[in-house]
Interface confidence: low
């Protein structure tokens, strides 16, 4: 039938309000209505090649590319993007069509390009081509700065390929540790691209434009410093430049420095040395190891040796793609109402992450601090003792990471009551989750001690806004209690709270709250 295409390609645009993570999925998120991408047979192509209409996506938007295959029998498939094979799990819809989906979350430039889907059915093979681009090519970009050696000069150039052209500055510090914090008087800033004074303790280059500020630190091994307890580690992606500086100070110039990679001397053209006299006529030598574009075989232990100092090493790891390593298992905490507490996530990531803390659909700024062992930590303390679900979300150019936390605040129950013609209900959000009792107040029991067990139904429900639990108890009306006062009480380890309800009274129900500690 000519009217029923064998293949249908659709684009689904997602509302970006969730932080779920994934790449290729058979069950994409609920979202907008699908947009037909046509999927016309490509003329003059060997084999059956369908081409979907070009897809333009806003930066940070989330989409699903979906193919519906109207072919009998089972199908198998494979996605290919930038020469990498991606997992593909077809499933079948209610009309028994094969459905293959590719979810792209938070679109970035690295995710733009051609997505090829190879489908094999019992009858024939197809190839479907999707071209995905970022909608407005005139995007601001802010790329992390990197270093280059200035031609024929002992100087470093700092480059950030960003639009609009960023202001590039060198941030130099000559003292140790805490005093090298950004706003410290020990910090000197130079708004220029080329740096000749390469002897400082701490050298960073920062680029800033309308999008913000990105910095790169010149990785340094200082032979005069006590080595870290854990070996320093430097991550780079294939194709990025590698720069390591080895620095040593000695009483005179009678010493030399050398670089080795896995016990083999670095080749000429991959290092250069500089030296200068310092205070008390001591001599500073620095030796740079550099590779303009790293490959996998540049991975290994780089050791700087001196004839007058103990050697020190750094582990350089070259990765194909960036990563975020952290445990993503959810964590539950319960604290007292005035207890000081911070959520924290320890992670190892490259390139540096951008992160947010989210609570009740509100995002909070995220700070990260580097630890000595190569890990970083992000803490969130601004929870204001509000119970519920807290989400840490981190991403870099290549990876995304989400971790959930639940915060429970230990407190005595607070009871709210409501009643209808047929039942009375009480609600409480205390923690730990309270237990319930219902009591009847009568002539026989003026203190409401007569317990009601019949017709009581307890449940806990998630109050979605905060992700906190609310416990409720419902009493179904019976002839035995009509017209009586009843009392519902919620109790936990921190106390008890009660509400008294007059059943079957016309008009608004009078509620009398009792607080019993």
């Amino acid at each position: 039938n000519q009217d029923l295409p064998v293949i249908k390609c659709v684009l689904i645009n997602h509302k970006n309000n969730d932080s779920s993570v994934g790449k290729s999925s058979s069950y994409p998120m609920v979202s907008e209505s699908p947009e037909d991408l046509g999927c016309a047979l490509r003329p003059q192509s060997s084999g059956t090649v369908y081409e979907a209409a070009a897809v333009e996506v806003d930066v940070s938007a989330s989409i699903t590319l979906q193919v519906l295959v109207d072919a009998p029998g089972n199908i198998s498939c494979l996605w290919v993007f930038k020469h990498s094979s991606l997992n593909c799990q077809p499933h079948f819809d209610l009309q028994n069509r094969g459905v293959v989906s590719m979810v792209i979350l938070k679109m970035t430039e690295t995710q733009a390009g051609e997505y090829l889907l190879f489908i094999q059915s019992e009858a024939t093979n197809y190839t479907i081509l999707f071209t995905v681009s970022i909608r407005n090519t005139l995007l601001y970009t802010l790329r992390r700065p990197y270093f280059r050696k200035m031609e024929n000069q002992d100087a470093l150039v700092c480059i950030s390929e960003s639009v609009p052209e960023p202001i590039v500055e060198w941030v130099l510090c000559d003292s140790q540790g805490e005093s090298c914090k950004e706003e410290s008087p020990a910090v000197v800033k130079k708004e220029e691209k080329v740096l000749h004074e390469l002897f400082g303790t701490d050298i960073r280059c920062c680029a800033r434009n309308e999008l913000g500020r990105e910095c790169t630190r010149l990785f340094t091994i200082d032979l005069n410093q006590t080595p870290q307890t854990t070996l320093p580690q430097l991550f780079l992606k294939v194709g990025e430049p590698l720069w390591i500086r080895c620095k040593a100070v000695h009483v005179n110039h009678g010493f030399g420095l050398t670089w080795e990679l896995e016990n083999k001397a670095l080749e000429e053209g991959n290092y250069f040395e500089m030296s200068t006299y310092s205070t008390n006529r001591t001599m500073i030598r620095i030796l740079f190891a550099f590779v303009s574009s790293v490959a996998r075989n540049d991975t290994g232990y780089y050791t700087c040796s001196s004839s007058k100092h103990p050697s020190q090493s750094a582990l350089v790891t070259i990765v194909e793609k960036g990563f975020i390593n952290a445990t993503n298992s959810s964590e539950d905490y319960e604290i007292d109402q005035y207890e000081e507490f911070c959520f924290s996530v320890r992670f190892k990531a490259y390139p540096q992450i951008r992160c947010t803390w989210t609570f009740s659909r509100k995002s909070f700024p995220c700070e990260q601090k580097g630890l000595d062992n190569g890990y970083s930590i992000s803490k969130f303390c601004n929870h204001k003792h509000q119970p519920g679900e807290y989400i840490f979300h981190a991403e870099n150019d290549d990876a995304q990471f989400t971790k959930m936390f639940t915060l429970n605040i230990r407190r005595k129950p607070q009871v709210l009551a409501e009643a209808s013609a047929s039942q009375a209900s009480c609600f409480s959000d205390g923690y730990p989750l309270p237990s319930w009792t219902w009591k009847k107040c009568s002539d026989k029991s003026p203190n409401c001690t007569e317990e009601i067990t019949e017709g009581v139904w307890n449940r806990k429900a998630n109050r979605k806004v905060f992700g906190q639990w609310v416990s409720s108890s419902t009493l179904n009306m019976s002839e035995a209690i009509k017209g009586f006062l009843v009392k519902c009480c919620a109790y936990n380890s921190l106390g008890t709270s009660c509400e008294t309800i007059l059943l079957n009274s016309p008009g608004p129900f009078p509620f009398i709250q009792d607080n019993i500690s």
């Epitope: 407005n136 090519t137 601001y140 970009t141 950030s160 390929e161 639009v163 052209e165 309308e210």
Partner: antibody, heavy 119, light 112 residues
Framework: QVQLVQSGAEVKKPGASVKVSCKAS????????LHWVRQAPGQGLEWIGV????????TYAQRFQGRVTMTRDTSTSTVYMELSSLRSEDTAVYYC????????????WGQGTLVTVSS | DIVMTQSPLSLPVTPGEPASISCRSS???????????LDWYLQKPGQSPQLLIY???SLQSGVPDRFSGSGSGTDFTLKISRVEAEDVGVYYC?????????FGGGTKVEIK
């Protein structure tokens, strides 16, 4: 210093194509957009499109869509603008200009290339 | 497309006297970042255009400070405090908020 040097004048017949080059120097080629603007004799300026040398993505004015192709060669820091199916009303001076960011003000311009379309 | 309308079409000036050119856009050029995406260019006879003012009021480096730009939203003005003989040429405003970027029709400044 920043320079944009364009290729020389061209005379073309209607229906033909023309490819104008613009060689950039004196700055990081991939850090700036390069726009193409034309000016018919005695007329005002008309924006044709833009290329991002970092990645090669392009945006064209609707009226040139399908006829214009902008490309770049990062090894030579050169951008190219090819206009096909030429008509007499395409006779104009074609300028390349360096754009600063999204708002794209043009701080440096090439010297211009006169393209004459005549049978 | 955003339509840019310039006035006057022609402006005869006396050297040493001030001059003013108006530019109006069919949509506001004020971006949420606070910038007005409106630039002014001068094209001297036989030359390529050159940037004078960007973001409505920022003077491009190297441009004499007798040139100034003002305005916001849809109405913009270029002023020359004291016209000099070298200021003759055609002045264009251009919007960079949306693609396609569009230019005003130009104002020809000539010495009386």
């Amino acid at each position: 210093q920043v320079q944009l040097v364009q290729s020389g004048a061209e005379v073309k017949k209607p229906g033909a194509s023309v490819k104008v080059s613009c060689k950039a120097s004196g700055y990081t080629f991939t850090s700036y957009y390069l726009h193409w603007v034309r000016q018919a004799p005695g007329q005002g300026l008309e924006w044709i499109g833009v290329i991002n040398p970092s990645g090669g993505s392009t945006t064209y004015a609707q009226r040139f869509q399908g006829r214009v192709t902008m490309t770049r060669d990062t090894s030579t820091s050169t951008v190219y603008m090819e206009l096909s199916s030429l008509r007499s009303e395409d006779t104009a001076v074609y300028y390349c200009a360096r754009g600063i960011g999204y708002g794209g003000y043009f701080d440096y311009w090439g010297q211009g290339t006169l393209v004459t379309v005549s049978s | 497309d955003i339509v840019m309308t310039q006035s006057p079409l022609s402006l005869p000036v006396t050297p040493g006297e001030p001059a003013s050119i108006s530019c109006r856009s069919s949509q506001s050029l004020l971006h949420s970042n606070g910038y007005n995406y409106l630039d002014w260019y001068l094209q001297k006879p036989g030359q390529s255009p050159q940037l004078l003012i960007y973001a409505a009021s920022s003077l491009q480096s190297g441009v004499p400070d007798r040139f100034s730009g003002s305005g916001s939203g849809t109405d913009f003005t270029l002023k020359i405090s004291r016209v000099e003989a070298e200021d003759v040429g055609v002045y264009y405003c251009m919007q960079g908020l949306r693609t396609p970027h569009t230019f005003g029709g130009g104002t020809k400044v000539e010495i009386k």
